[in-house]
């Protein structure tokens, strides 16, 4: 009799799952913070810019790309300690003599005001109040971003207990 009881319980579990499906929702993964249409992850350790870039890639994300001043302000509002700063996905392209986002686009002059030198091996970080350039070899915290993804939310049978 035991096998049939076991099968019965599996059938019930499957049935519960089917009947408790919810509509698709936009969700950020655990530990990531939702900021409008993005999910952000603030690192807890420090790294040079290149290592930060690589870390975001391993998380199927990218270093933070900032579209405008409003997004900059929203992100800075999440930095709760004025003594901590974060790498973003912007560095100086020597060949093009311009600030370049890691998606290939160039910084437009009215987007961000960067304090510091625009020169070879310069990368950009943000603090609670400012945007700075610094040697890319400098070890800092960083911010990864990924777009909000569709997740099929299901109510776990365990939540009924």
């Amino acid at each position: 009799q035991k096998p049939s009881i076991g099968k019965c319980s599996v059938d019930i579990q499957q049935n519960r799952t089917k009947t408790t499906e919810r509509p698709d929702l936009l969700n950020c993964p655990i530990y990531w913070q939702q900021v409008q249409e993005k999910c952000l992850l603030f690192s807890h350790t420090v790294n040079p810019w290149n290592n930060s870039l690589a870390d975001c890639s391993t998380k199927e994300s990218s270093l933070l790309l900032i579209q405008d001043k409003d997004e900059l302000t929203r992100t800075q509002n999440l930095i709760h300690d004025k003594a901590i700063s974060f790498w973003i996905g912007l560095n100086f392209s020597l060949s093009e003599k311009n600030w370049k986002w890691i998606n290939g686009s160039f910084l437009s002059s009215n987007d961000l005001k960067i304090t510091g030198d625009a020169k070879e091996n310069s990368c950009v970080y943000i603090s609670q109040t400012s945007v700075y350039s610094e040697y890319c070899s400098t070890e800092m915290k960083w911010i990864c971003q990924k777009e909000l993804t569709l997740v099929r939310n299901k109510v776990s049978p365990d939540s009924w207990l």
Partner: antibody, heavy 122, light 108 residues
Framework: QVQLVESGGGLVKPGGSLRLSCAAS????????MSWIRQAPGKGLEWVSY????????YYADSVKGRFTISRDNAKNSLYLQMNSLRAEDTAVYYC???????????????WGRGTLVTVSS | DIQLTQSPSSVSASVGDRVTITCRAS??????LAWYQQKPGKAPKLLIY???SLQSGVPSRFSGSGSGTDFTLTISSLQPEDFATYYC??????????FGGGTKVEIK
């Protein structure tokens, strides 16, 4: 408690060696740039050396280059300064200092130890 | 190397006085300057960074200003605990990180 405690100072003859240690506690040591700064008796402050969080980047003042070696052990929350070929002019209180995290290699020293006295004399 | 010249080297003042200390850099350093306070037998304490940012826990009577080559530390109303030596420090991203010679604030 957030603090830095130096040790290892003492009296040494010219040409001798000494190893200073700095024990950090109360903060994530491996996140911070750390420096040694010294102050000769009755004189001003002189930055000696810095080391990046991972230990990958190191700089020295010209006055100690080739004689002093800075290092760190993040597992032990410790900073070190190996001082060789010591001279009378190296006599000073040596401070271990932590840098503000917000300013990259623009090193503002927001946390200092009490210092350890190194005396170089025959 | 960038040199920092502080003036005056010492100043005598009374409690309640407004005290101003200046620091001049031998070349432009943008706003990469700090001010420290040091009392005898003690380690220095960070007061101001980035020329004008007040460090956490430092009383608001301390303020910093300036950019380029000329910088000022002002104590708006001197308190008994403010009698000490004050140092400026430049922190452009290429070492060495030089300090000024110090300004001793003494009781009048």
């Amino acid at each position: 408690q957030v603090q830095l405690v130096e040790s290892g100072g003492g009296l040494v003859k010219p040409g001798g060696s000494l190893r200073l240690s700095c024990a950090a506690s109360g903060f994530t040591f491996s996140d911070y740039y750390m420096s040694w700064i010294r102050q000769a008796p009755g004189k001003g402050l002189e930055w000696v050396s810095y080391i990046s969080p991972s230990g990958a980047t190191i700089y020295y003042a010209d006055s100690v280059k080739g004689r002093f070696t800075i290092s760190r052990d993040n597992a032990k929350n410790s900073l070190y300064l190996q001082m060789n070929s010591l001279r009378a002019e190296d006599t000073a209180v040596y401070y271990c200092a932590r840098s503000l995290m917000s300013t990259g290699t623009h090193l503002y020293f927001d946390l200092w130890g009490r210092g350890t006295l190194v005396t170089v004399s025959s | 190397d960038i040199q920092l010249t502080q003036s005056p080297s010492s100043v005598s003042a009374s409690v309640g006085d407004r005290v101003t200390i200046t620091c001049r850099a031998s070349q432009g350093i943008s706003s990469w300057l700090a001010w420290y306070q040091q009392k005898p037998g003690k380690a220095p304490k960070l007061l101001i960074y980035a020329a004008s940012s007040l460090q956490s826990g430092v009383p608001s009577r301390f303020s910093g200003s300036g950019s380029g080559t000329d910088f000022t530390l002002t104590i708006s109303s001197l308190q008994p605990e403010d009698f000490a030596t004050y140092y400026c420090q430049q922190v452009t991203s290429v070492p060495p990180y030089t300090f000024g010679g110090g300004t001793k604030v003494e009781i009048k």
